[in-house]
């Protein structure tokens, strides 16, 4: 019968020919006139046989990532009779892996959004690299992830590529971060190949800022002839948050005379001071009221940032009008 060994060829061999192995029949004692033949895809081109000895050589550089095995057929003929010595047999030449492919991040670009002030350990995103080398061949495709840029705010789990928060971040100080992740094969050992990817991490706003009045005192005037409902001036607060978290409501905190009201312009986020009752210069020529401002939407969990509302004092002077 055929005497079989496993046939392997390392990929990317630079030699002009590489000895793969030898076809042999156990009937071949060296004194026979046995001629070995190689058939199938790759025979005569990729693989050449010395028909006199059965020695098979690879004469082309092979790429395992392109083709990992070749199925060939062997024949052996006794040239004295012209007959087959053994039945034709199929066998495999495997292309063995070398570490010739670097890890690649296939899902680039990576972008993630995470709420500001998220606690340490919060999962941001998972990045995954692929390595075309053989995962069953040593460590050629075993990857380790590391952080090249992004400390101290982020960390990456070495084996999973999961990026987590390692330090709280304030969107109002910096609203986005570029993190650079490296994947190394050979589990980072010498001779490892690497690939990198960038991750844009944006911080989404949480309502961690209360609105604060720009001025602690506003001076307004109102004519004694002004009808009720007249807008006599505006006040304004600022909020470092954005969007819904910066929406605010103004209100009167103190107005003993109950003469004034404040309504909120939700487009401009201003407070409009309105005359609720007519005023009379001769009766009272000035008023002092206190206004307060609060966010429109406050999450229960963020109440600690909103315990005391910002207030401002408004002095209103009544203008005299000549009466007939």
């Amino acid at each position: 019968g055929w005497v079989w060994n496993q046939f392997f060829v390392p990929e990317e061999m630079n030699t002009t020919s590489h000895h793969v192995g030898r076809l042999r029949s156990d009937l071949d004692n060296g004194n026979n006139s046995f001629q070995y033949k190689l058939l199938g895809a790759g025979a005569g081109s990729t693989f050449i046989i010395d028909e006199r000895t059965g020695d098979i050589y690879a004469i082309e550089k092979l790429d395992r990532e392109e083709r990992s095995l070749y199925i060939l057929r062997a024949q052996v003929i006794d040239i004295t009779t012209g007959r087959a010595v053994e039945p034709e047999s199929e066998f495999v030449i495997k292309v063995s892996d070398i570490n010739d492919n670097e890890p690649k991040f296939l899902d680039e670009p990576y972008e993630a959004i995470v709420p500001e002030m998220s606690p340490e350990g919060t999962l941001v995103i998972q990045v995954t690299a692929s390595d075309a080398d053989d995962p069953s061949s040593g460590n050629n495709a075993r990857l380790l992830y590391s952080l090249l840029q992004g400390q101290p705010y982020f960390s990456v789990e070495p084996t999973t590529g999961v990026i987590r928060i390692s330090s709280k971040m304030d969107r109002e100080l910096q609203d986005e971060y570029w993190v650079i992740i490296q994947a190394k094969d050979m589990i980072g050992q010498p001779g490892a190949l690497s690939g990198t990817t960038s991750v844009l991490i944006k911080l989404s706003d949480v309502n961690d800022n209360k609105p604060i009045f720009k001025e602690s005192l506003y001076r307004l005037t109102v004519s004694e002839s002004a009808p009720t409902g007249t807008s006599i001036g505006t006040i304004m607060a600022y909020d470092n948050d954005i969007g819904e978290n910066a929406e605010m409501d103004y209100s009167i905190e103190e107005d003993d005379s109950q003469t004034f009201d404040i309504i909120t312009n939700h487009e401009t986020q201003e407070g409009i001071v309105i005359l609720k009752k007519k005023v009379n210069f001769e009766h009272q020529n000035h008023y002092g009221i206190r206004a307060k401002v609060k966010n429109h939407h406050v999450d229960e969990q963020l109440m600690k940032y909103h315990t005391e509302a910002s207030t401002t004092f408004i002095k209103i002077q009544v203008e005299d009008v000549d009466e007939p």
């Epitope: 000895h19 060296g30 006139s33 050449i48 028909e51 050589y57 040239i79 004295t80």
Partner: antibody
Framework: QVQLQESGPGLVKPSETLSLTCTVS????????WSWIRQPPGKGLEWIGY???????NYNPSLKSRVTMSIDTSKNQFSLTLSSLTAADTAVYFC??????????????WGQGTLVTVSS | EIVLTQSPGTLSLSPGERATLSCRAS???????LAWYQQKPGQAPRLLIF???SRATGIPDRFSGSGSGTDFTLTISGLEPEDFAVYHC?????????FGGGTKVEIK
Amino acid sequence: QVQLQESGPGLVKPSETLSLTCTVSGGSISGYYWSWIRQPPGKGLEWIGYIYYIGSTNYNPSLKSRVTMSIDTSKNQFSLTLSSLTAADTAVYFCARDGSSGWYRWFDPWGQGTLVTVSS
Amino acid sequence: EIVLTQSPGTLSLSPGERATLSCRASQSVSSSYLAWYQQKPGQAPRLLIFGASSRATGIPDRFSGSGSGTDFTLTISGLEPEDFAVYHCQQYGNSPLTFGGGTKVEIK
């Protein structure tokens, strides 16, 4: 047409190693078997062995332990190394082309031969 | 290995005569894988016959080969002056390849 030319030392000391080179011109070394044959003075021819262009070799069992052959397809050359020389290795050494793929064939063409004398 | 015995060792003939050279193998030579060569002093052998009976390119038809199995013959029908040389047989049906000891054809 294909021509072969042997080159190497004419005189070698006993116990030393002989190195000969055969240069092929007028055709490619690839695709063929290449043999070395020797002829002691006044005697018959002896096949030493062959090398295939891919590097596969087969040597005469009588010399196998002392013979090494190599091939350089880029230079269109093949070589013979014979170690532990004695006076019995004194001969004219020929290189010749065997067939292309397949079973053994006759030798054609031949180099003109080079005389190697083993003497101290 | 197959041992080839050539006879006679020397053949003395005159130009124009017929020469018959014998090559006997110690065992059957596969598929008549036998060649004949001519060698002149100081020269390399020159292929005459292969496959026991096929003439090589450029070989005159006065040279012919025959035989099979273990007995092979080279015949030169009418010797020309340039034919006086040593003739070798060689088998290539089995490894190692072997040559006969040679037959010298000399002028009588």
